[in-house]
C-alpha cells in the first residue's frame, strides 16, 4: 500500500495528494519550453535554462537550488571546416559528399545553433581507403568477418549500422580489428517501422535524419581528464594523450540517402547471411572496396572536430527532510540535449519539473518527506554523463553514507505501448506495488491498473502473472550512483512493443526531428502516457522519501542471484573437459547464494515484527536495507573497469546499454576457447567466482541480527 | 507565392567573368537543391548545374565543367552562377529552377518545378 | 549522357481535338527504388518554362486534367485529351535518373 506517513500532522498530505497535483497539461506546457532552441551541453543556451529552471525550483518552494559547475572535456564540430564523407575517384577529386546538415524541420528552418551531425569526441582526420561494411560493428560480426570469411579491416574504413549496441562499443571493436576510420549509418531496417510516414508526416527517420552521439569508452569514468575526482577549478588534468576513452580513429555518422551512395557501390564478399542485410536496396556486400566499375574510387573522410575544455551546470534542488535529513533519495535526469530534445532528454526533464512542482505546493501546505530528496538537472550526459558523474565524485562521501536510492528521469518515452522498468531487484516490490496502484493510460485498459496492462504486454519471462523489470545496464545519468557508489537505483519510461518494432530505440533519436511536434503530433498527443511516467517516477520518490520502513525487499535480491549464478554455471558449463581439467567449481558461488536466501528471508521476518516505534532499531534496520546495495560493491572494481565496482552487475563489455549479471565471472569466460594460454584464463575465471561468492556472502552478513 | 527572381546578366567580352544571382522567396530556399538550365536563342534547354539544398555537391554540364561554379547562401535565400572564361557558345537565357522535391523526401536529383524568369547573358566582342 | 529523342518536331492542332507527343530515351529512367524520373514541360512563348508532368504520368499541381502522361522504361507520351489555345507551346521531355540531366529537343505545338 501507499504510505499514508507524512511528517505533517495532516493526514492529507499522503501519496494520493502528490499524485492528484500532477497534471498532463503542465506536463505538455513544460516540455514546448524546454524544446523551443538547442541546449547542447557547453553551450551559453544551456546554461541560460539552468539558470531558468534553478528560478522556477524555487517559486515551486524547494529549500534550495543551486547550479554546481565543472570545467570538463567537451567535442564541438569546427564552424568553419564541416565534416563530411567523400567518394573520391583515381585523381583524388570528390564525386560524391555526404550531407553537411539534415534538412531542417518544417518552422525551424531559421534557428540558429543546430549542431551538424558528428560523433563527439572523434579525432581529427583525413584517411582514405577502401570500404569495409560491417553490419552493426558489434563484437559477434568482428568475430564472423576476421574468423569465418577472413576479411582484414586493418587500414580499411568501416561502415556500420547503428542500432543493437552502444555506438561506443562499435567504434572499440573497429579499432581493435585495425581500421584506420568508421562511418555510422542509420538502416532503415532499424530506424524505419513499416507502414509509418518519416517526419514531418510521421515519426520515422528520413533519409537526411542523422544519429548524433558520443563515441567514448569511458567505462564510468566521467570527465576524460579527470577520472576519479571532479573537474573543479583546482582540479589536476590529465594530458589528451592520458585521456580516458577517447577514440583513435575518425568517426562520423551519416543518414540513409548519404550511405545508399556508399553501399550501393560495394564489391568484394557478399553478406555471409540475411542477418547482414538491411532494407536499403543496396547488396550489402561488405568489400573490401567497390564493385569491378568503381573499384579505382575509394572513401575518404574528412573530420575536423575539436576537444574542448568547458564548463558545464548541474541543477541541484532541495527538499529537506523533517526526520531523516540526512538520508537522500534523489531524482534526477539530463537538461542538456543534442538539438531540440524534444524526446531526449526534454520529455524526462519535463516531468522531473511537474514532479518538483507537485512536491513544491505540498511543502508549501506544510507537509515535509520524512526523508530529503535532491533534484537534479544534469549537464552533458550526452557527452558521456559528465554532469552527474562529476557531481557524484565531487560528493561521493556524503552519496556513499547517505544515498538511500536514485531514480533516473531521462527520456519519458520512447513509445506509447506500455511501461518499461529497469531498476536493483531491492526495488521490485516498490514497482510492483505502486503500479497497482495506479490507473492504466493505455487503450482497453480503461478502469485497470499500470499494472495488469504493463503484465499483460510486457510480461515477465520467468514468472507468470507478473511484468518484466530489466537489469540496469548503463548509458545513463544512474551509472555513477549504481555502478560506482552501490546506491539502490531505477528507471523507468514508456516504450515501444518490441515484439513488433524490431528498429533500435526510436527512429528520430538524437536527429534534428526530435521536436515538440514530434511527441505531440505522433507520440502522446495527451500527454497520457507522460503522465503515468511522472506518476511511476514520482511514486517510487515519494515512497522512498516517506515510508518509516525503506520500501525495499531484500527477498528478491535473494531470487535474482540464484538464477544469475545459474545461468553463468550453465555458459561455464560449456566447457566440461576445462572445468574438470582446471578444478573449476561453483560451489562457493552457489552456498553464499544459498547462505544469502536464508539470510534475507529472516531478515525480512524481523522487519515485519520490529518495534516501529523505537527510532533507533527503525534506523538501524533502514540501514541495513540501504547498505545492501553498498555491499555489493567492491572497492577493486572490475579488471580493467576501476570505476564499474558493483558485482552483481555492470554495463555489458559489448554493449554499454546492456546490463551483465556477474559481470566478472562472464568477462573472464567470454570467447575463453580463443585464448591462448587457457590455464591462465581458466584461473582467471576461478579468481572471479572467488570474488563474486565472498561478495554475496558479505552482503548476506550485513542482513544479519547485528549483535 | 514561390518566386524566383533571376539577375546579374549583361554584356560581357569572352574571357571575361560575370555572376549570376537567384533570390528565392515563398518557400524553405534551405530545404532545396536547386539548378541552373539554359536556352540559347532559339535553341532548346540545356542543364548547367545542381547544388544539393545543403551545398554539400555541385555537379556540372562538361560544357561548363572548371569555369562555372553553383553556390548558395541558405541565410540569404540565394543561389549563385560565377561564370568564368565566358565563351561566345555560352550566351543564352539563364534560369534558376527549384528542386521539385524539398531534401527531406528525396536524395536523388529531381526535376525542376518552378523557374524564375531567366537573365540574359551576351558574350560577345 | 542519356539522350532523349522527341516526336514529332512539331504539331498543328485543330482546337477540342487531341494530340500525342512521344519521348524515347537511350536508356531506361526506372530508378532501383521504383520511381521512373521522365517529366514533361511546356514552354510558352516569351515565358519560362512550366512543369505539367513528373515521374512520367503524375499531373503537377494546377496542370489541368486534359493533360496525362504514360509510359515505362524507355517510351513515354504525353497526350492533350481536348487542344486549347492556351496550349501552345514547346513541349520538352527531361529525364533525371542520372546526371546530366538531358532535355528532348522539343515539339512545338500549333493551333490550326
Known amino acids: 500500500k501507499s504510505s499514508n506517513e507524512a511528517t505533517n500532522i495532516t493526514p492529507k498530505h499522503n501519496m494520493k495528494a502528490f499524485l492528484d497535483e500532477l497534471k498532463a497539461e503542465n506536463i505538455k506546457k513544460f516540455l514546448y519550453n524546454f524544446t523551443q532552441i538547442p541546449h547542447l551541453a557547453g553551450t551559453e543556451q544551456n546554461f541560460q535554462l539552468a539558470k531558468q529552471i534553478q528560478s522556477q525550483w524555487k517559486e515551486f518552494g524547494l529549500d534550495s537550488v543551486e547550479l554546481a559547475h565543472y570545467d570538463v572535456l567537451l567535442s564541438y564540430p569546427n564552424k568553419t571546416h564541416p565534416n563530411y564523407i567523400s567518394i573520391i575517384n583515381e585523381d583524388g577529386n570528390e564525386i560524391f559528399n555526404t550531407s553537411l546538415f539534415e534538412p531542417p524541420p518544417p518552422g525551424y528552418e531559421n534557428v540558429s545553433d543546430i549542431v551538424p551531425p558528428f560523433s563527439a569526441f572523434s579525432p581529427q582526420g583525413m584517411p582514405e581507403g577502401d570500404l569495409v561494411y560491417v553490419n552493426y560493428a558489434r563484437t559477434e560480426d568482428f568475430f564472423k568477418l576476421e574468423r569465418d570469411m577472413k576479411i582484414n579491416c586493418s587500414g580499411k574504413i568501416v561502415i556500420a549500422r547503428y542500432g543493437k549496441v552502444f555506438r561506443g562499443n562499435k567504434v572499440k571493436n573497429a579499432q581493435l580489428a585495425g581500421a584506420k576510420g568508421v562511418i555510422l549509418y542509420s538502416d532503415p531496417a532499424d530506424y524505419f517501422a513499416p507502414g509509418v510516414k518519416s517526419y514531418p508526416d510521421g515519426w520515422n527517420l528520413p533519409g537526411g535524419g542523422v544519429q548524433r552521439g558520443n563515441i567514448l569508452n569511458l567505462n564510468g569514468a566521467g570527465d576524460p581528464l579527470t577520472p576519479g575526482y571532479p573537474a573543479n577549478e583546482y582540479a589536476y588534468r590529465r594530458g589528451i594523450a592520458e585521456a580516458v576513452g577517447l577514440p583513435s580513429i575518425p568517426v562520423h555518422p551519416i543518414g540513409y540517402y548519404d550511405a545508399q551512395k556508399l553501399l550501393e557501390k560495394m564489391g568484394g564478399s557478399a553478406p555471409p547471411d540475411s542477418s547482414w542485410r538491411g532494407s536499403l536496396k543496396v547488396p550489402y556486400n561488405v568489400g573490401p572496396g567497390f564493385t569491378g566499375n568503381f573499384s579505382t574510387q575509394k572513401v575518404k573522410m574528412h573530420i575536423h572536430s575539436t576537444n574542448e575544455v568547458t564548463r558545464i551546470y548541474n541543477v541541484i534542488g532541495t527538499l529537506r527532510g523533517a526526520v531523516e535529513p540526512d538520508r537522500y533519495v534523489i531524482l534526477g535526469g539530463h537538461r542538456d540535449s543534442w538539438v531540440f530534445g524534444g524526446i531526449d532528454p526534454q520529455s524526462g526533464a519535463a516531468v522531473v519539473h511537474e514532479i518538483v512542482r507537485s512536491f513544491g505546493t505540498l511543502k508549501k501546505e506544510g507537509w515535509r518527506p520524512r526523508r530529503t530528496i535532491l533534484f537534479a538537472s544534469w549537464d552533458a550526459e550526452e557527452f558521456g554523463l559528465l554532469g552527474s558523474t562529476e557531481w557524484a565524485e565531487e560528493n561521493s562521501r556524503l552519496l556513499q553514507e547517505r544515498g538511500v536510492a536514485y531514480i533516473n528521469a531521462d527520456s519519458s518515452i520512447e513509445g506509447n505501448y506500455t511501461l518499461r522498468v529497469d531498476c536493483t531487484p531491492l526495488m521490485y516490490s516498490l514497482v510492483h506495488n505502486l503500479t497497482k496502484e495506479l490507473k492504466s493510460p493505455d487503450e482497453g485498459f480503461e478502469g485497470k491498473s499500470l499494472y495488469e496492462s504493463w503484465t499483460k504486454k510486457s510480461p515477465s519471462p520467468e514468472f507468470s502473472g507478473m511484468p518484466r523489470i530489466s537489469k540496469l545496464g548503463s548509458g545513463n545519468d544512474f551509472e555513477v550512483f549504481f555502478q560506482r557508489l552501490g546506491i539502490a537505483s531505477g528507471r523507468a519510461r514508456y516504450t515501444k512493443n518490441w515484439e513488433t518494432n524490431k528498429f533500435s530505440g526510436y527512429p528520430l533519436y538524437h536527429s534534428v526531428y526530435e521536436t515538440y511536434e514530434l511527441v505531440e503530433k505522433f507520440y502522446d498527443p495527451m500527454f497520457k502516457y507522460h503522465l503515468t511516467v511522472a506518476q511511476v517516477r514520482g511514486g517510487m520518490v515519494f515512497e522512498l522519501a516517506n515510508s518509516i520502513v525503506l520500501p525495499f525487499d531484500c527477498r528478491d535480491y535473494a531470487v535474482v542471484l540464484r538464477k544469475y549464478a545459474d545461468k553463468i554455471y550453465s555458459i561455464s558449463m560449456k566447457h566440461p573437459q576445462e572445468m574438470k581439467t582446471y578444478s573449476v567449481s561453483f560451489d562457493s558461488l552457489f552456498s553464499a547464494v544459498k547462505n544469502f536466501t536464508e539470510i534475507a528471508s529472516k531478515f525480512s521476518e524481523r522487519l515485519q515484527d520490529f518495534d516501529k516505534s523505537n527510532p533507533i532499531v527503525l534506523r538501524m534496520m533502514n540501514d541495513q536495507l540501504m547498505f545492501l546495495e553498498r555491499a555489493f560493491i567492491d572497492p577493486l572494481g572490475l579488471p580493467d573497469r576501476p570505476f564499474y565496482r558493483h558485482v552483481i552487475y555492470a554495463p555489458s563489455s559489448h554493449n554499454k546499454y546492456a546490463g551483465e549479471s556477474f559481470p566478472g565471472i562472464y568477462d573472464a569466460l567470454f570467447d575463453i576457447e580463443s585464448k591462448v594460454d587457457p590455464s591462465k584464463a581458466w584461473g582467471e575465471v576461478k579468481r572471479q567466482i572467488y570474488v563474486a561468492a565472498f561478495t554475496v556472502q558479505a552482503a548476506a552478513e550485513t542482513l544479519s541480527e547485528v549483535a | 507565392q514561390v518566386q524566383l527572381v533571376e539577375s546579374g546578366g549583361g554584356v560581357v567580352q569572352p574571357g571575361r567573368s560575370l555572376r549570376l544571382s537567384c533570390a528565392a522567396s515563398g518557400f524553405t530556399f534551405i530545404s532545396y537543391g536547386m539548378h541552373w538550365v539554359r536556352q540559347a536563342p532559339g535553341k532548346g534547354l540545356e542543364w548547367v548545374a545542381v547544388?544539393?539544398?545543403?551545398?554539400?555537391?555541385?555537379y556540372y554540364a562538361d560544357s561548363v565543367k572548371g569555369r562555372f561554379t553553383i553556390s548558395r547562401d541558405n541565410s540569404k535565400n540565394t543561389l549563385y552562377l560565377q561564370m568564368n572564361s565566358l565563351r561566345a557558345e555560352d550566351t543564352a537565357v539563364y534560369y534558376c529552377?527549384?528542386?521539385?522535391?524539398?531534401?527531406?523526401?528525396?536524395?536523388?536529383?529531381?526535376?525542376?518545378?518552378?523557374w524564375g524568369q531567366g537573365t540574359t547573358v551576351t558574350v560577345s566582342s | 549522357d542519356i539522350v532523349m529523342t522527341q516526336t514529332p518536331l512539331s504539331l498543328s492542332v485543330t482546337p477540342g481535338q487531341p494530340a500525342s507527343i512521344s519521348c524515347k530515351s537511350s536508356?531506361?529512367?526506372?530508378?532501383?527504388?521504383?520511381?521512373?524520373?521522365l517529366y514533361w514541360y511546356l514552354q510558352k512563348p516569351g515565358q519560362p518554362p512550366q512543369l505539367l508532368i513528373y515521374?512520367?504520368?503524375n499531373r503537377f499541381s494546377g496542370v489541368p486534367d486534359r493533360f496525362s502522361g504514360s509510359g515505362s522504361g524507355t517510351d513515354f507520351t504525353l497526350k492533350i485529351s481536348r487542344v486549347e489555345a492556351e496550349d501552345v507551346g514547346l513541349y520538352y521531355c527531361?529525364?533525371?535518373?542520372?546526371?546530366?540531366?538531358?532535355f528532348g529537343g522539343g515539339t512545338k505545338v500549333e493551333i490550326k
Open positions: 536508356q531506361s529512367l526506372l530508378h532501383s527504388d521504383g520511381k521512373t524520373f
Open positions: 529552377a527549384r528542386v521539385l522535391v524539398g531534401a527531406l523526401y528525396y536524395y536523388n536529383y529531381y526535376g525542376m518545378d518552378v
Open positions: 515521374e512520367v504520368s
Open positions: 547544388i544539393s539544398y545543403d551545398g554539400s555537391n555541385k
Open positions: 527531361m529525364q533525371s535518373i542520372q546526371l546530366p540531366l538531358t
